[in-house]
């Protein structure tokens, strides 16, 4: 639970924070888990502990492994684990997935790309930024503090962005690089009157008595993030929860975003052990948003079991 993955490249600085937090006054002890060997605190060592931080200056492939940190509070010794992997530098430009930090999304209005983990390091501006291994040049790109700002973002700006900076430790400089993907999202969303894709209006659904049946209410509401949108089922004009039949339950399906970018929702109505009286009910699929409400009605009919003897 209190475990964290960290990674870096050989011959670069890597600083890892203990996954357990604590007051600055708390003592933190670090161990190499495989050998239970204590990590020294003296800065003359290439790998040393400094409170909540474990520093590899610089990192080596052989440093890979699990490190244990124990935060000693007045009441408890709290244990965390740092799973560290150091990779060899790639000769080609491609940054493999395992070296990637979380993807960030941007839009025309907001195009900040933060340099991952930089707050752990003692660095000085400016940061260097690269996209797909090419140094970024031009007035559209502005390195500001620990992030990159892109003016007038376009879909072509999507890609892998690498920040490069220098960590300084007692006068010695160490290089650090970190890469993350940037995606561009279209903010030109809109909302429209709900469109129910299923069921069809006045659809007759065949069911077998004694078996289970599922009805899916599916509707689309526009493009992009919708402020208010819902799909639900009613029985004889009554909410499912108020109808009071435990055999009949509705279950939210997956939010769907189709290839055309429409924002759609599903609601599945599950009927367990279908009974004769279920055929007498009116099943309404309702889709509503700020534009209004649309209703499609479904009725159930008995499906005659196949007579295998005829």
């Amino acid at each position: 639970k209190f475990s964290k993955q960290s990674w870096g490249l050989e011959n670069e600085a890597l600083i890892v924070r203990c996954p357990r937090q604590g007051k600055p006054s708390y003592t933190v002890d670090w161990y190499y888990s495989q050998t239970n060997k204590s990590i020294p605190t003296q800065e003359r060592n290439r790998v040393f502990a400094s409170g909540q931080l474990l520093k590899f200056l610089p990192a080596a492939v052989a440093d890979s492994g699990i490190y244990t940190c124990i935060v000693r509070s007045p009441t408890f010794n709290r244990t965390g684990y740092a799973n560290v992997t150091i990779y060899k530098k790639q000769s080609d430009c491609n940054v493999p997935d395992y070296l990637m930090y979380s993807t960030v999304s941007g839009s025309e209005k907001n195009s900040k790309i933060y340099c991952p983990t930089i707050d752990l390091y003692n660095w000085t501006a400016p940061l260097e930024w690269f996209k797909n291994c090419q140094a970024l040049q031009g007035s559209r790109y502005r390195a500001h503090k620990s992030f990159l700002v892109i003016d007038n973002v376009m879909t072509e700006d999507a890609g892998d962005y690498t920040c490069k900076f220098i960590h300084n430790e007692n006068g010695a400089n160490y290089s650090v690089t970190a890469t993350r993907s940037f995606t561009v999202k279209d903010e030109q969303g809109f909302s429209l009157f709900p469109v129910i894709g299923a069921p069809a209006q006045n659809e007759i659904k065949e069911v077998e008595i004694g078996k289970n049946a599922n009805l899916t209410c599916s509707a689309c509401f526009g493009k992009g993030t919708q402020f208010l949108a819902a799909v639900l089922w009613q029985l004889n004009g009554t909410k499912i929860t108020d109808f009071g039949e435990p055999r009949i339950q509705q279950e939210e399906g997956q939010n769907q975003s189709f290839s055309n970018g429409l924002a759609c929702l599903d609601m599945v109505l599950r009927i367990a052990d279908v009974k004769e009286e279920d055929l007498l009910l009116q099943y309404d699929c309702l889709a509503l948003n700020l534009h209004g409400l649309r209703r499609h009605t479904v009725r159930l009919s008995r499906k005659n079991p196949i007579d295998h003897h005829s």
Partner: antibody, heavy 121, light 106 residues
Framework: QVQLVQSGAEVKKPGASVKVSCKAS????????MYWVRQAPGQGLEWMGA????????AFNQKFKGRVTMTADKSTSTAYMELSSLRSEDTAVYYC??????????????WGQGTMVTVSS | DIQMTQSPSSLSASVGDRVTITCSAS?????MHWYQQKPGKAPKRLIY???KLASGVPSRFSGSGSGTDYTFTISSLQPEDAATYYC?????????FGQGTKLEIK
């Protein structure tokens, strides 16, 4: 929201034991240590000890060591505090409590409603 | 054990007054927490880490201090502030509380 619900009031004879329960909800029980604080009638607050529900590790105020047992049941998200060899001065309201941010020990932010334990012959 | 001494042990003040409670620790502590308790109720955290205001707590409450001497202040006393106030240290085992300051409204 975080809730700590304690068991009801108890009346015990001197020399007996009492076991107070504290059922947690609204958060992951094993993510936060549970602390126990008591308050005698008209008196101040006194920390008794704590348990880490994840590991079962305990920390005690030496004053109570040997008399207090703290346990946690992960399956029911319930912490227990048992005090043995009761004497009249153990008459108090017993509270379970936890910090807001466990690792930063930032004060007791959440409290149970308290359990009144009366020790009387 | 670190002993916490609060002063005064009780005080009476008028609505709108500025009220100050002090807490002196027998050894140096890194942080102080402050609680409010009303009769029949569990304590409520007001200030944590010496000077940080807990969520939902009015800004008239504040805290300061370092080392062995800490202060809790109510800038403008309100009728609902009648209660007992406790300081607490979390720097050393056992965790200890002050004996409390009972605040009455005149």
């Amino acid at each position: 929201q975080v809730q700590l619900v304690q068991s009801g009031a108890e009346v015990k004879k001197p020399g007996a034991s009492v076991k107070v329960s504290c059922k947690a909800s609204g958060y992951t029980f094993t993510d936060s240590e549970m602390y126990w604080v008591r308050q005698a009638p008209g008196q101040g607050l006194e920390w008794m000890g704590a348990i880490d529900p994840e590991t079962g590790d305990t920390a005690f105020n030496q004053k109570f060591k040997g008399r207090v047992t703290m346990t946690a049941d992960k399956s029911t998200s319930t912490a227990y505090m048992e005090l043995s060899s009761l004497r009249s001065e153990d008459t108090a309201v017993y509270y379970c409590t936890r910090a807001f941010d466990n690792d930063n020990d930032d004060g007791f932010a959440y409290w149970g409603q308290g359990t009144m334990v009366t020790v009387s012959s | 054990d670190i002993q916490m001494t609060q002063s005064p042990s009780s005080l009476s003040a008028s609505v709108g007054d500025r009220v100050t409670i002090t807490c002196s620790a027998s050894s140096s502590v890194n942080y102080m927490h402050w609680y409010q308790q009303k009769p029949g109720k569990a304590p409520k955290r007001l200030i944590y880490d010496t000077s940080k205001l807990a969520s939902g707590v009015p800004s008239r409450f504040s805290g300061s201090g370092s080392g062995t001497d800490y202060t809790f202040t109510i800038s403008s006393l309100q009728p609902e502030d009648a209660a007992t106030y406790y300081c607490q240290q979390w720097s050393s085992n056992p965790l200890t509380f002050g004996q409390g300051t009972k605040l009455e409204i005149k």
